[in-house]
């Protein structure tokens, strides 16, 4: 038994990092592998993650992280049973990749505005609380050329557009993600998308 | 919102002990370190020692190596800094403070006074 | 004793910008990161900088930090009267065995 692709993980700056991995064939992750990780510091403990399939040959591993900071570093040993297939370490705030904002809701009824809200994934005592900005994709569900990003740079988590910039009449969809500078972090998976019908009063030609 | 309540102030003779306690609240208790801090009075802090609230190992300054003993209850959320064979340098605020590689919370502080 | 060394005391007037520096070596600063804490008169330190340079939540981006090589640099802009405390920097000594080491203290002075 061999590792064919080694693991490499993300982390959401929170509670949990991800990693992936291939082995050289079909295998049962959960009850040929274990996966070690223990943070280098003072005290620390080693942890045990048992790993799911990902896949014929690929694993996955969710390893839960309490209190990550920029000075964390882990290492981490695949073990098969009594044998070492792989020694490695991982710094999560090099590693980023936020969670998924939710909550996102399209209110229709502010003045021919359409106003878009989501809720910030991460506590106000989490650093990338006040350092994530957002893109919004809005797509219509009947012309697949109507799809179009709006880049969210300020921290509120909003955006604010007229809604005779889409087309009156038919249905929307909307999903958001989010990124963080600070740690060039990879941008989060979208957030499910909400779904609204646009309609608005088209101005009166004199 | 996280809480570090530390017990009242303390006057002891030279060479007796002292255990200060640290309840916490807020928080997970388990999940994050927590450390013992001094000051005597006018000086500036010294770092005494991390207790590991999860498993309870603990690491001290070598200046206290021998003398001071840190402990934790799970079930109460407490945390406990013992330090014996009290000298009259050892008068000081001790405070408790949560924390990995820096102190986020602090106690409010105990103030212990050896005296004879 | 400290290996962190801070200038005793700084002092400015209101609405001016002072940083208090903090000097160590290759096994702590040079090797480590750096927290920085204000402690107002009475009471108990507060984290006021970790990670080098990153602000805890709900405090002011008047405060900001620095490091470079083994020092580090706390920034304080737009001086009020209640920033009137003793800051002391720290930081992980990675000597055998490893353990947090603090500043002298630096008491600042609003004029």
């Known amino acids: 038994m061999k590792v064919l692709q080694e693991p490499t993980c993300v982390s959401d700056y929170m509670s949990i990092s991800t990693c992936e991995w291939k082995m050289n064939g079909p295998t049962n992750c959960s009850t040929e592998l274990r996966l070690l990780y223990q943070l280098v510091f003072l005290l620390s403990e080693a942890h045990t993650c048992i790993p799911e399939n990902n896949g014929g040959a690929g694993c996955v591993c969710h390893l839960l992280m309490d209190d990550v900071v920029s000075a964390d570093n882990y290492t981490l040993d695949l073990w098969a049973g009594q044998q070492l297939l792989w020694k490695g370490s991982f710094k999560p705030s090099e590693h980023v990749k936020p969670r998924a904002p939710g909550n996102l809701t399209v209110h229709t009824n502010v003045s021919d505005t359409l106003l878009l809200t989501w809720s910030n994934p991460y506590p106000p005592d989490n650093y990338l609380y006040n350092h994530l900005t957002y893109a919004v994709n809005i797509w219509s569900e009947n012309d697949p050329a109507d799809f179009r990003i709006y880049n969210v740079t300020y921290l509120e988590p909003s955006l604010r557009i007229a809604a005779s910039t889409l087309k009156s009449g038919i249905s929307y969809r909307a999903r958001v993600r989010a990124w963080a500078q600070c740690y060039n972090t990879t941008w989060s998976e979208w957030s499910p998308s909400t779904k609204w019908h646009n309609s608005y009063r088209e101005p009166f030609e004199q | 919102q996280v809480q570090l309540v530390q017990s009242g102030a303390e006057v002891k003779k030279p060479g007796a002990s002292v255990k200060v306690s640290c309840k916490a609240s807020?928080?997970?208790?388990?999940?994050?370190?927590m450390h013992w801090a001094r000051q005597a009075p006018g000086q500036g802090l010294e770092w005494m020692g991390i207790i590991n609230p999860s498993g309870g190992s603990t690491s001290y300054a070598q200046k206290f190596q021998g003398r001071v003993t840190m402990t934790r209850d799970t079930s109460t959320s407490t945390v406990y800094m013992e330090l014996s064979s009290l000298r009259s340098e050892d008068t000081a605020v001790y405070y408790c403070?949560?924390?990995?590689?820096?102190?986020?919370?602090w106690g409010k502080g105990t103030l212990v006074t050896v005296s004879s | 004793q400290s290996v962190l060394t801070q200038p005793p005391s700084v002092s400015a007037a209101p609405g001016q910008k002072v940083t208090i520096s903090c000097s160590g070596g290759s096994s702590n600063i040079g090797n480590s990161y750096v927290s920085w804490y204000q402690q107002l008169p009475g009471t108990a330190p507060k984290l006021l900088i970790y990670d080098n340079n990153k602000r805890p939540s709900g405090i002011p981006d008047r405060f900001s930090g620095s490091k470079s090589g083994t020092s580090a640099t706390l920034a304080i802009t737009g001086l009020q009267t209640g920033d009137e405390a003793d800051y002391y920097c720290g930081t992980w000594d990675t000597s055998s065995p490893p353990q947090p080491i603090f500043g002298t203290g630096t008491k600042l002075t609003v004029l």
């Open positions: 807020g928080y997970a208790f388990t999940s994050y370190y």
């Open positions: 403070a949560r924390g990995k590689w820096w102190l986020y919370n």
